[in-house]
Interface confidence: medium
């Protein structure tokens, strides 16, 4: 049905032809996500009179299907305007039942008309900056994050679960306002581990779940990115001892994700998520990456379980064969790894052992080659001055931050990136902070050793002397050439 | 049945051994010595890495060595405000407030008088009123069309603290200072068995003989130039744009026979002033044939690519092209910030409407 | 363990206005919704109001609808109950109480109570 038809049935006022109006409409736009430019003006006038409804109130035996037109024509850039004022959005608000009021809404609200009215609220935020605002000031936050605390007591059907987070984290992402008022007053580390715990059904004891089944992997993943949203700028602050513990509990939660995979083909993108919020712990809540105990089966280095260490250098692998979004595909994990092997000698060894094994094929360039080290030496040249740095900081603490062993395993060429930003092209301190870390050298590194050019990092044989067979003056001719190009250069 | 060896032939073969690692140690002493040359444009923040250098490891410059800086400063600051004091007249932009005049004529008394590592109250007070004017901000935006020091406005917007008299410049102030290098400075530094020489390389001709053993066997180049150069336009004494004017240089460098077998690191400098001016100043003033978009990661690779296709002898020879932004010390910390309103734009972008 | 403190009653003539506070000494407070309560001088002890964990959400008593308004700060562990109009019949001993359950008027969903601060309206 046109919208200028369902326009008009509206404007007649006859209750049972505008309600067959708006199912037809329904019906034949659920799918749209596009809209059609010639009929916009109708679209708009359509809206302009939902919303005078809607801000009225909705007879209660048809709002789902109002809502559901509604829910259409918000995903219309052209109609924001109209949905985006503080009374339609109180209205849904209201129906979503995370209006901030004085008195509960008595009856126990219909599961069909919140969802739809959640949705709805999903669309407006995303797309409309005024929305974002409103939604902001109406706090609606608050709210949300108390039905998420009602979670353990009441159920909520999957759906509307989903929705609040959704809602949850646009309102995250958007505003940074909410993110403060959801981390600070509403303690939303907290409300959203117990969450995370609760979705994932584990207790921190237990070992690993094998699979994550499909509704719970999507509520998860909302939860690890809401998360994400109110840490990033909150915990580069010192933590105290209790905060610690709780992040020191979430980080036992993230060991589970990571060792868990999700229903369908969503693993990667669930561990994404969780890694993204590894990032984000304080510094000093990451032993708990590696304080799982040791069982049959498990990946033991130095005494200590690398099942989880192992689990991200594996994600790392798969991240390094993709070209698209990489700086936010590999910068995490490598930020993740290099804080762990910087405070931790086993799981530097451990991942010197994997990434830098001691050299034995010394003819070929660092970056040339398809180990992980290869690909790794290969971003420190990056156009991306931050997947640079992050590959290179990686490689560099590997080293235990000895500038020889780091030339020695990437090349001063690939190497000069990092040395010249952090001020040690030209030495600085003679060895890294970890002076009990060894480095082995194999009998082919030591039988090269003398052919290895450090720039290249790899055995190359001496070059004929270009000048060879010259006199003095016909070099001198020739650095003089030289000398008249620097002195261009240099004005 | 096997074979055993005598105590004498024993100690041949110790002896041989111990022969040929002799000559690998000597082998390896010669091969272990790595020569570099350090070479860049005036302002391709070459001497910044040097400075660099000194700022994170060795605890930074001393408050002495910091002290020394405050002349170079000064005259870096008045320098800055008498290039676009001047570019007004050949751009004729009138200043904002006629008074302003006056004071542009007292600034060139002023600077004439002034004493090396001071600056008076009156010369401060002229220098501040003169880069507040809306006619010398609108001369500075243009400084693209002529030659002005990167470190002007840092400089000029913290006039109040330099004109103070008992300053003394900061590590930052230390970075941004510009001193025209010349002649050759040479480096030793050792990295475990590795010795590194390294020549920075200025434009004075000294005797001949020093830059012959300069050239000869040099491992690598280090060649630096500043990014945010490839919209200047041209002194009237100049024939090319100044990224053209490297360019050039480069292919002469790179492809020079003293330099067949030499690697190349090339530092692409001031990557964060490009980042800001790409996004007003196309790349088609530098490069007209260029076709790409002008966000930084399209120009930046367009540009790199530019150098590194001069290299004629890409099978023998590496070029390892590294990004930088040099007078930024804090860059250097390792953080995980920069990513993340990548992260959150992009798991925005991944969500649909319902 | 949760310990409340009531804090901010005391005297004052018909019309006026009073504000209590309730601290507490957990930082875990701040997930639990909290109510008010009086009683009367020879009386049950009766519901005044309650406010949700987060703040989302309250509920008044007939009797004090439009007058009192509660309100939390979570940053500092604090629920206020803001008295205005007083009447003689507001006289009595208020009490503050917490629910890890949920907020509403039983007396028995909440597990903590405070001590009580005398609220006297004279006429």
């Known amino acids: 049905m046109e919208p200028r038809a369902v326009a008009d049935a509206l404007e007649t006022g006859e209750e049972d032809a505008v309600t067959e109006a708006l199912r037809s409409f329904n019906r034949e736009h659920s799918q749209s996500f596009t809209f059609d430019d010639a009929q916009q003006e109708d679209r708009k006038r359509l809206a302009k009179l939902l919303v005078s409804v809607l801000e009225q109130g909705l007879s209660p035996k048809h709002r789902v299907t109002w809502l559901q037109t509604i829910r259409i024509l918000s995903r219309d850039r052209s109609c924001l305007d109209s949905f985006a004022s503080r009374q339609s959005l109180h209205a849904l608000a209201c129906y979503a039942d995370i209006a901030i009021s004085e008195e509960p809404i008595p009856q126990p609200p219909d599961m069909d008309v919140l969802l739809e009215s959640l949705k709805c609220l999903c669309n407006l935020v995303l797309s409309s900056p005024t929305a974002q605002m409103l939604a902001a000031e109406a706090r609606l936050v608050v709210r949300l994050a108390e039905r998420v605390g009602l979670y353990r007591k009441r159920s909520y059907p999957h759906e509307v679960q989903f929705f609040d987070l959704r809602l949850l984290f646009l309102l995250t992402a958007l505003r940074t306002d909410v993110r403060q008022q959801l981390f600070q007053e509403l303690h939303g580390v907290r409300l959203l581990t117990d969450a995370l715990e609760l979705t994932l059904g584990v207790a921190p004891k237990e070992n690993p779940l094998v699979i994550l089944p499909a509704q719970e992997t999507e509520r998860a993943m909302e939860i690890l990115k809401v998360l994400f949203n109110i840490t990033y700028d909150s915990v580069k602050r010192e933590v105290d001892e209790e905060d610690a513990a709780l992040y020191r509990y979430l980080g036992t939660l993230l060991r589970h994700c990571v060792m868990a995979d999700a229903a369908g083909d969503r693993t990667e993108e669930f561990h994404g998520h969780t890694v993204n919020l590894l990032g984000n712990l304080p510094l000093k809540c990451l032993d708990v990456l590696l304080a799982l105990e040791l069982h049959e089966g498990s990946l033991e280095f130095m005494g200590v379980n690398m099942d989880v260490i192992n689990a991200l250098l594996a994600f790392l692998e798969k991240r390094l064969h993709q070209t698209h979004r990489l700086k936010e595909c590999v910068a995490p994990v490598l930020s993740v790894l290099t804080e762990c092997a910087r405070m931790h000698r086993p799981a530097r060894k451990f991942l010197k052992a994997q990434v830098l094994p001691p050299l034995r094929d010394v003819r070929t360039r660092p970056e040339v080659g398809d180990l992980l080290r290869n690909k790794l030496v290969r971003l420190m040249t990056h156009l991306d001055t931050d997947v640079k740095r992050v590959a290179a900081e990686f490689l560099f603490v590997l080293c235990s931050e000895s500038v020889p062993r780091f030339i020695k395993y990437t090349g001063y060429g690939n190497a000069a990136g990092l040395l010249a930003a952090r001020g040690l092209m030209a030495g600085g301190r003679p060895e890294g902070q970890y002076s009990e870390d060894e480095d082995t050298d194999t009998e082919e590194y030591r039988e090269a050793k003398a052919s290895i050019n450090p720039v290249t990092g790899r055995v190359e044989e001496k070059p004929p002397n270009p000048m060879e067979g010259m006199t003095e003056e016909q070099k001198e001719h020739e650095a003089m050439k030289l000398v008249n190009m620097f002195d261009k250069l240099s004005r | 049945m096997g074979c055993t060896l005598s105590a004498e032939d024993k100690a041949a073969v110790e002896r041989s051994k111990m022969i040929d690692r002799n000559l690998r140690e000597d082998g390896e002493k010669a091969a272990r010595e790595v020569k570099l040359l350090l070479l860049g444009a005036g302002e391709s923040g070459k001497s910044t890495i040097v400075k660099q250098m000194k700022i994170i490891h060795e605890a930074g410059y001393s408050e002495e060595e910091c002290k020394q800086y405050k002349a170079v400063v000064y005259s870096n600051t008045i320098q800055s405000i008498i290039a676009i004091i001047r570019a007004m007249g050949r751009l004729k932009i009138d200043f904002g407030d006629a008074a302003r005049a006056d004071d542009a004529r007292q600034l060139f008394v002023l600077a004439g008088a002034a004493e090396e590592g001071f600056m008076t109250a009156e010369l401060a007070g002229v220098i501040k009123r003169l880069w507040k004017d809306s006619g010398v901000q609108a001369c500075f935006n243009r400084s693209r069309e002529y030659q002005l020091n990167d470190s002007a406005a840092y400089y000029l917007n913290d006039l109040d603290r330099i004109a103070q008299p008992n300053y003394i410049p900061t590590q930052q102030d230390v970075l941004r200072t510009r001193v025209k290098t010349t002649g050759i400075v040479e480096t030793h530094f050792t990295f475990k068995d590795l010795h590194f020489k390294m020549f920075d390389v200025g434009g004075q001709r000294s005797e001949r003989k020093k830059w012959i053993h300069c050239f000869e066997g040099v491992t690598a180049i280090i060649f630096c130039v500043a990014l945010s150069d490839y919209d200047l336009v041209l002194a009237e004494d100049e024939e090319m744009n100044r990224m053209h004017e490297s360019m050039k240089l480069f292919d002469s460098i790179c492809n020079n026979k003293w330099f067949t077998d030499t690697s190349i690191i090339l530092f692409l400098n001031k990557k964060d002033l490009f980042e800001e001016k790409i996004k007003k100043s196309p790349l088609t003033i530098c490069y007209p044939e260029y076709a790409g978009s002008n966000t930084y990661e399209e120009a930046a690779a367009y540009i790199q690519c530019q150098f590194e296709d001069l290299n004629k002898r890409k099978d023998t020879k590496e070029i390892y092209t590294h990004f930088t932004c040099a007078t930024d010390t804090k860059n250097v910390q390792f953080v995980f910030d920069a990513v993340t309103d990548v992260i959150i734009k992009n798991n925005l972008k991944d969500c649909g409407l319902f | 363990q949760v310990q409340l403190v009531e804090s901010g009653g005391g005297l004052v003539q018909a019309g006026g206005s009073l504000r209590l506070s309730c601290a507490a000494s957990?930082?875990?407070?701040?997930?639990?919704?909290a109510g008010w309560f009086r009683q009367a001088p020879g009386k049950e002890r009766e519901f005044v109001g309650a406010?949700?964990?987060?703040?989302?959400?309250?509920k008044y008593a007939d009797s004090v609808k439009g007058r009192f308004t509660i309100s939390r700060d979570n940053s500092k562990n604090t629920v206020y109950l803001q008295m205005n109009s007083l009447k003689s019949e507001d006289t009595a001993v208020y009490y503050c109480?917490?629910?890890?359950?949920?907020?509403?008027?039983?007396?028995?969903?909440?597990?903590?109570w405070g001590q009580g601060t005398q609220v006297t309206v004279s006429s």
């Open positions: 109480a917490s629910s890890s359950i949920e907020f509403g008027p039983l007396e028995d969903t909440y597990d903590y």
């Open positions: 406010i949700t964990w987060g703040g989302g959400r309250t």
């Open positions: 957990a930082r875990t407070f701040s997930r639990y919704g």
